[in-house]
């Protein structure tokens, strides 16, 4: 079985987390998908989900979270705009497939939001506009209330150092490769 892995992102307040969750399009293209936060020792909590069935490239906004599902490409795009320090935590994408348990997608995202000036390499330091202008056609979707207890058999690790990965340790704060994380205020 594939081991659970994490990618760690360190962003500043006010910035946007912009990630993608990868799925098998033949199996899950129109399945309902959700973005969850996993708090230590608790059941995953669903923060936002796509419609049921999931609509192709149709943005769904719940508060500061925008989901966009690209069926042809097997990708769910997740944006969390105007990040706050309290948003720090471990997140995951899941696919709802009732009556079966939700199917977890890899990788989990370890988000660390810190206070301070958000101008970093890869960001546009002069930009004050919210570059994620959400079209008025966005929809709020109703998410299923159930959450799989099997996804919380143990508290998730507190840092990427505890995570077993298939190849090399993934921690965006200590890799030698150049990492381009698009960061827009």
């Amino acid at each position: 079985a594939t081991k659970l892995t994490e990618e760690k992102y360190e962003l500043k307040e006010g910035q946007t987390l912009d990630v993608k969750c990868d799925y098998t399009l033949e199996k899950f293209a129109s399945s309902q998908k959700a973005w969850q936060i996993i708090r230590d020792g608790e059941m995953p909590k669903t923060l936002a989900c796509t419609e049921r069935p999931s609509k192709n490239s149709h943005p769904v906004q719940v508060g500061r979270i925008i989901l966009e599902d690209y069926h042809d490409h097997g990708l769910l795009r997740v944006r969390m705009v105007n990040l706050q320090v309290e948003d720090s935590g471990l997140y995951q994408c899941v696919i709802y497939q009732p009556p079966k348990e939700p199917h977890m997608l890899f990788d989990r995202i370890r988000l660390v939001v810190t206070k301070g000036f958000s101008g970093t390499p890869g960001s546009n330091e002069n930009s004050t506009q919210n570059v994620y202008k959400i079209p008025p056609t966005t929809t709020k979707a109703l998410c299923p209330l159930y959450t799989s207890p099997r996804t919380v058999t143990q508290a998730p690790p507190k840092s990427t150092a505890d995570v077993s990965t298939p190849d090399s340790e993934i921690n965006l704060t200590n890799v030698t490769d150049i990492i381009r994380v698009p960061v827009f205020n």
Partner: antibody, heavy 122, light 107 residues
């Protein structure tokens, strides 16, 4: 250093299939998407789709759905793009390109293969 | 799909000239725009990512700006080795799309 090395030129007959390989080195193969882009002679660049080497999941542009398959062999850090039911309009140079990390919404192609010319002719 | 319109399609300038290429998106793409240089018979090379960020090792005479739908790529002082075709590419929405390219020649 990061390198993507593609297989050599191919000449195919209409209706046949072609499989182009792209061997990656100098980085962790499973951490970055592999994308495929083609360019017909004198024409612009056309994105065909992407593959996540970690999961093996792939997605294709509508124009190519049903004809293209992107796969990988992680043991040799190699990605493959197979295009079937070839027609003369598929004559082009096919490039593999490294995209962003598998979990970031980033399609910045920072490293490219040298290109593989596929000629479709009867 | 998002259309990317590049202009001009070709231009001729003298060594040392300032060269400007524009790329217009058919809808708002935020700052999700990259610029590539392609020399004849070679693969494209990334010059600028996310509208204005210079790729490592790329000379500082290359720059980019813009936001939303209108983007500009500039070579502040054209050099003989800059003879190439330049392409913009958006990634705000899938499918990814490229501009038609701008061929830069020396007068």
């Amino acid at each position: 250093q990061v390198q993507l090395v593609q297989s050599g030129a191919e000449v195919k007959k209409p209706g046949a299939s072609v499989k182009v390989s792209c061997k990656a080195s100098g980085y962790t193969f499973t951490s970055y998407d592999i994308n495929w882009v083609r360019q017909a002679t004198g024409q612009g660049l056309e994105w065909m789709g992407r593959m996540n080497p970690k999961s093996g999941n792939a997605g294709y542009v509508q124009n190519f759905r049903g004809r293209v398959t992107m796969t990988r062999d992680t043991s040799i850090s190699t990605a493959y793009m197979e295009l079937s039911s070839l027609r003369s309009e598929d004559t082009a140079v096919y490039y593999c390109a490294r995209g962003g990390r598998t979990s970031i919404w980033s399609f910045v192609f920072d490293y490219w293969g040298q290109g593989t010319l596929v000629t479709v002719s009867s | 799909d998002i259309q990317m319109t590049q202009s001009p399609s070709s231009l001729s300038a003298s060594v040392g000239d300032r060269v400007t290429i524009t790329c217009q998106a058919s809808q708002d793409i935020s700052k999700h725009l990259n610029w590539y240089q392609q020399k004849p018979g070679k693969a494209p090379k990334l010059l600028i990512y996310d509208t204005s960020n210079l790729e490592t090792g790329v000379p500082s005479r290359f720059s980019g700006s813009g936001s939303g739908t209108d983007f500009t790529f500039t070579i502040s002082s054209l050099q003989p080795e800059d003879i190439a075709t330049y392409n913009c590419q958006q990634y705000d929405k899938l499918p990814l799309t490229f501009g038609g390219g701008t061929k830069v020649e020396i007068k």
